[in-house]
Interface confidence: medium
């Protein structure tokens, strides 16, 4: 599915994946374990969560979001190094909050260009854009503080507690449902 969120590929170069296995469909395998894993989605050009059964499957499976991004997104490590070395923020840091269209309630972080800080938001579990980080630290490292230096302080504590419903929440029904992938 095409996702166009004013998201240019200039920072991440060509959208051709780094390895052929990154183009494989997510494969949970035949076993029945419930292991949260990550795969590279060729259609959204993002690393996304899925539930791995614990056996078989394929190489497009990673234990962490970061590992998936490093392995499958062209130029990702270069972008991260560039950010850490004080160069400008990657383009995707300026994308607006996008919870996607699904109804999962995943706690994620995004860079808010208005406040110039990483903030918590609720991700629905599918689609969305690349301004979406699993940890506050990863968001800060890439988008908030690309020149390095230490974050910390009270703001981090308050930020970690702040959670608000945004577009993609359940405005009519107020049914709280949680996805585990």
């Amino acid at each position: 599915l095409s996702e166009e969120a004013d998201d240019t590929d200039s920072e991440l170069g060509s959208m051709k994946p780094l390895h052929t296995f990154c183009a494989m469909k997510a494969d949970d395998g035949p076993c029945k374990a419930m292991i949260r894993s990550y795969f590279f989605n060729m259609y959204t050009h993002q690393c996304e969560e899925f539930i791995y059964g614990g056996c078989e499957g394929n190489e497009n499976r990673f234990d962490t979001l970061e590992e998936c991004k490093k392995t499958c997104i062209p130029g990702y490590e270069k972008t991260a190094v560039k950010a850490a070395s004080g160069a400008e923020r990657p383009d995707f840091c300026f994308l607006e909050e996008d919870p996607g269209l699904c109804r999962g309630y995943m706690k994620r972080y995004l860079y808010n260009n208005q406040t110039k800080q990483c903030e918590r938001f609720v991700y629905g579990g599918c689609l969305g854009n690349r301004n979406n980080f699993e940890t506050l630290d990863e968001c800060k490292k890439i988008c908030e503080n690309p020149g390095g230096g230490s974050g910390g302080g009270l703001n981090d504590i308050f930020e970690a507690q702040k959670i608000e419903w945004h577009e993609g929440g359940p405005p009519h029904h107020h049914h709280h449902h949680h996805h585990h992938h």
Epitope: L1, E96, C102, G125, E167
Partner: antibody, heavy 118, light 113 residues
Framework: EVQLVESGGGLVQPGGSLRLSCAAS????????MSWVRQAPGKGLEWVSA????????YYADSVKGRFTISRDNSKNTLYLQMNSLRAEDTAVYYC???????????WGQGTLVTVSS | QSVLTQPPSLSGAPGQRVTISCTGS?????????VQWYQQLPGTAPKLLIF???NRPSGVPDRFSGSRSGTSASLAITGLQAEDEANYYC????????????FGGGTKLTVLG
């Protein structure tokens, strides 16, 4: 009361263009993602495209990618679907719907018929 | 060919209980994505019947209930009434497709008598 009213359908030749509109009322339009879903005569439902509340993110089914463009004007409470390079297989009733419960479409318009034929 | 598979038709007598099945795969229902159900009465737009697997919007009678288990989902209608005659569609998200919001092919429910 939530109301969604589609317009702009009609008969068009293959290769031609049409722009559908969906006028929304009865809810805070800018707070909701919106979708277009179509139904070919006598067939099932097919999701076409969606757009986030602010309009910053758009999504398309493969069958229309590169030919259709979804947009919205929140000041006018209106959703649009610009359809170019139309094909016979695009013939359908086009519904606009609001993503009230995100992946669920809470409210639907009455639909507007698009016929692509020479 | 729809990503989610439904029986094309079902029938039941008034007062009976009918169940409409929706079978998916590990990339949609089996990946813990919600299923929704829509009712489409003849000549009208679809109407949301069940969202988030088993939740009814206000105004939908409790004769309608939904469930999801593994790669399958079902819609149960108890105390079948003449006005339930309609097409019913299941819908979910599929992470392996580019057209990610997916529907079943629809089930035409006929109320006998």
């Amino acid at each position: 009361e939530v109301q969604l009213v589609e317009s702009g359908g009609g008969l068009v030749q293959p290769g031609g263009s049409l722009r559908l509109s969906c006028a929304a009322s009865g809810f805070t339009f800018s707070s909701y993602a919106m979708s277009w879903v179509r139904q070919a005569p006598g067939k099932g439902l097919e999701w076409v495209s969606a757009i986030s509340g602010s309009g910053g993110s758009t999504y398309y089914a493969d069958s229309v990618k590169g030919r259709f463009t979804i947009s919205r004007d929140n000041s006018k409470n209106t959703l649009y679907l610009q359809m170019n390079s139309l094909r016979a297989e695009d013939t359908a009733v086009y519904y606009c719907a609001n993503n009230g419960a995100a992946a669920a479409w809470d409210y639907w318009g009455q639909g507007t018929l698009v016929t692509v034929s020479s | 060919q729809s990503v989610l598979t439904q029986p094309p038709s079902l029938s039941g007598a008034p007062g009976q209980r009918v169940t409409i099945s929706c079978t998916g795969s590990s990339s949609n229902l089996g990946a813990d994505y919600d299923v929704q159900w829509y009712q489409q009465l003849p000549g009208t737009a679809p109407k949301l019947l069940i969202f988030g697997n088993n939740n009814r919007p206000s105004g939908v009678p409790d004769r309608f209930s939904g469930s999801r288990s593994g790669t399958s989902a079902s819609l149960a209608i108890t105390g079948l009434q003449a006005e339930d005659e309609a097409n019913y569609y299941c819908q979910s998200y599929d992470r392996s497709l580019s057209g990610s919001m997916v529907f079943g092919g629809g089930t035409k429910l006929t109320v006998l008598g």
